[in-house]
């Protein structure tokens, strides 16, 4: 058993049929010595008396808010949560496996630049009685500071018969140099509590590997005389690291109709303009990627050919 | 400890082309190592990230773009003194700081070159003959060093009398290649910045 936060404790249980469970001793936070009784949740049934209560925690029915009273007055609470271990593996029931970039990916993180700011998100089908707490650091043995905000519900989607909820959190490394060469990864830890179930999820990464620039901005077209060719120009996104001559981007320019199966014109360039062939009912799209370290491409920025 | 935005002569930078070749060569070599050593811990997640130049050179700090010198977190206290005569410095206006930066890059290359050559000598003794260093990568390191053209004491190649542990050597190769790729990215960024300045 360990303390998650004040008056909230996590009991780690090997979860299998007829498991013996864990013996837990609860102590009432009071100077009083006698006349103390214990109850669980809203029940008025007295579970025991005395300053300490010894319980055998085997299942979710044994978890919950234990309260010690004296003469009708509440003295203190202890909330017990369960953390299940099945076949030596901690349970991952609360969050959905996003399977990208590999199986057992519960947390996904992205950074728009090298400033040390990044966003992580996760998915769940659970809509109520759910709380998250996020901590992060650079390295684990001698951790350096990363400050994370509160996790918030950022999107709701309907997937088949059930709803899917996306939560996200923003974090900022306390003293980040955009030009630094990372040798210690960022560690992100998410504590998830659903009703009386506790789970924790972790992710470890280098900022350089989670870079995904914003799309290029200010796309403009200029038709070329006596030709089907069009000059398309754009600018670096505002959120990208500066100076741009140091943090350079490379671009992919594509002309395509509405369907992905349609024919297309595609060219890669390090410049902020390119010449392509425009077709009726097609769109010109441009996306960006770090020129020197190939992490993710940005989403497309698009303008219609016409 | 930073690069002032000098205005060098147009086309001053023969090093830009070489640095692009360097990044390409080390990335290809790393990819080859990952594929060939698929049953060894050779991915970014599996290896320890070591920097053989740590406390010996200060490339990131010495080559910091002017715009980042206002960022307290970028101004590390590591200082190293270097020789200052390089052929990439085609402009008389080139500052002492730029020379310091390029000479730091030269020292990095020299250190990695020695490590890679020592390692290759060991890998050539491996009866499995599983992986060797790409001669193109070694040649590209040499070309960039020549373009930088700094006078420097030659570092003797490390020779070892004991029987090499080939497993450890291959893991060390992965560690070195990952670190060298990161440094090659920095070098490319620096050359691009200097070329644009």
């Amino acid at each position: 058993i360990w303390e998650l936060k004040k008056d909230v404790y996590v009991v780690e249980l090997d979860w299998y049929p007829d498991a013996p469970g864990e013996m837990v001793v609860l102590t009432c936070d009071t100077p009083e010595e006698d006349g103390i009784t214990w109850t669980l949740d809203q029940s008025s049934e007295v579970l025991g008396s005395g300053k300490t209560l010894t319980i055998q925690v085997k299942e979710f029915g044994d978890a919950g808010q234990y309260t010690c009273h004296k003469g009708g007055e509440v003295l203190s609470h202890s909330l017990l949560l369960l953390h299940k271990k099945e076949d030596g593996i901690w349970s991952t029931d609360i969050l959905k496996d996003q399977k990208e970039p590999k199986n057992k990916t519960f947390l996904r993180c992205e950074a728009k630049n090298y400033s040390g700011r990044f966003t992580c998100w996760w998915l769940t089908t659970i809509s109520t009685d759910l709380t998250f707490s996020v901590k992060s650091s650079r390295g684990s043995s001698d951790p350096q500071g990363v400050t994370c905000g509160a996790a918030t519900l950022s999107a709701e989607r309907v997937r088949g018969d059930n709803k899917e909820y996306e939560y996200s959190v923003e974090c900022q490394e306390d003293s980040a140099c955009p030009a630094a060469e990372e040798s210690l990864p960022i560690e992100v830890m998410v504590d998830a509590v659903h009703k009386l179930k506790y789970e924790n999820y972790t992710s470890s990464f280098f900022i350089r590997d989670i870079i995904k620039p914003d799309p290029p901005k200010n796309l403009q077209l200029k038709p070329l005389k006596n030709s089907r060719q069009v000059e398309v120009s754009w600018e670096y996104p505002d959120t990208w690291s500066t100076p741009h001559s140091y943090f350079s981007l490379t671009f992919c320019v594509q002309v395509q109709g509405k369907s992905k199966r349609e024919k297309k014109d595609r060219v890669f360039t390090d410049k902020t303009s390119a010449t392509v062939i425009c077709r009726k009912n097609a769109s010109i799209s441009v996306r960006a990627q770090d020129r020197y370290y190939s992490s993710s491409w940005s989403e497309w920025a698009s303008v219609p050919c016409s | 400890r930073n690069l002032p935005v000098a205005t060098p002569d147009p086309g001053m930078f023969p090093c830009l082309h070489h640095s692009q070749n360097l990044l390409r060569a080390v990335s290809n070599m790393l990819q080859k190592a990952r594929q060939t050593l698929e049953f060894y811990p050779c991915t970014s997640e599996e290896i320890d990230h070591e920097d053989i130049t740590k406390d010996k050179t200060s490339t990131v700090e010495a080559c910091l773009p002017l715009e980042l010198t206002k960022n307290e977190s970028c101004l590390n206290s590591r200082e190293t003194s270097f020789i200052t005569n390089g052929s990439c410095l085609a402009s008389r206006k080139t500052s002492f700081m730029m020379a310091l930066c390029l000479s730091s890059i030269y020292e990095d290359l020299k250190m990695y070159q020695v490590e890679f050559k020592t390692m290759n000598a060991k890998l050539l003794m491996d009866p499995k003959r599983q992986i060797f260093l790409d001669q193109n990568m070694l040649a590209v390191i040499d070309e960039l060093m020549q373009a930088l053209n700094f006078n420097s004491e030659t570092v003797p190649q490390k020779s070892s009398l004991e029987e090499p542990d080939f497993y450890k050597t291959k893991i060390k190769l992965c560690i070195l290649l990952h670190a060298f790729r990161i440094r090659a990215v920095t070098i490319d960024r620096v050359m691009s910045y200097l070329n644009a300045s």
Epitope: R261, K263, K264, D265, R266, V267, I277, R279 | -
Partner: antibody
Framework: QVQLVQSGAEVKKPGSSVKVSCKAS????????LHWVRQAPGQGLEWMGW????????EYAPKFQGRVTITADESTSTAYMELSSLRSEDTAVYYC???????????LGQGTLVTVSS | DIVMTQSPLSLPVTPGEPASISCRAS??????LHWYQQKPGQAPRLLIA???QSISGVPSRFSGSGSGTDFTLTISSLQPEDFATYLC?????????FGQGTKVEIK
């Protein structure tokens, strides 16, 4: 299986014209760009131009501008390349090529040898 | 027009050995470079698109690298069927242009 089948070899006199055909099978004809490239004996490839069969749009290499005409007939899934004012240096194997991507070729025809000789 | 220069023009290789072919552009073309294989009397066949993207059905021993002006096609271990002429093509701008070809011959 996508195939491009070209018309047979031709022998032409200098100053005349030649029209080579390229019949596509497999896949929708208008879903692809169609190009013509040529290869003189012992030489590399030379790009001549492309057509978008969907709308008839064409683009020609400046070297052939005014001398080459590329057309397409959607009803027969056939593209044509006509080269006029032939000279001896036009002796080459002419290939049609296609792709959904405009700027390179994933399938090429078997080639048509055009010999220009007096 | 962008001029593509291949080297060497002829490359004698022992079967089972690796081979590398170089292609250089007269100006920077990013990764807009494609490789083809051509056997005598046959049409060219696409091997690699955009400098390094493998093409379905092409053996994995063929790989490409490079960007800007310098590109390389590598055959990790030459098989008897790989003895042919290899061509590079730029797609950075029209007119599309090709290298003059590198003939890989049996040593």
């Amino acid at each position: 299986q996508v195939q491009l089948v070209q018309s047979g070899a031709e022998v032409k006199k200098p100053g005349s014209s030649v029209k080579v055909s390229c019949k596509a099978s497999g896949g929708t004809f208008s879903d692809y760009y169609l190009h013509w490239v040529r290869q003189a004996p012992g030489q590399g490839l030379e790009w001549m131009g492309w057509i978008d069969p969907e709308n008839g749009d064409t683009e020609y290499a400046p070297k052939f501008q005014g001398r080459v005409t590329i057309t397409a007939d959607e009803s027969t899934s056939t593209a044509y390349m006509e080269l006029s004012s032939l000279r001896s240096e036009d002796t080459a194997v002419y290939y049609c090529a296609r792709n959904k991507e405009l700027r390179y070729f994933d399938v090429l025809g078997q080639g048509t040898l055009v010999t220009v000789s007096s | 027009d962008i001029v593509m220069t291949q080297s060497p023009l002829s490359l004698p290789v022992t079967p089972g050995e690796p081979a590398s072919i170089s292609c250089r552009a007269s100006q920077s073309i990013s990764i807009n470079l494609h490789w083809y294989q051509q056997k005598p009397g046959q049409a060219p066949r696409l091997l690699i698109a955009f400098a390094s993207q493998s093409i379905s059905g092409v053996p994995s021993r063929f790989s490409g690298s490079g960007s800007g002006t310098d590109f390389t096609l590598t055959i990790s271990s030459l098989q008897p069927e790989d003895f042919a002429t290899y061509l590079c093509q730029q797609s950075n701008s029209f007119p599309l242009t090709f290298g003059q070809g590198t003939k890989v011959e049996i040593k």
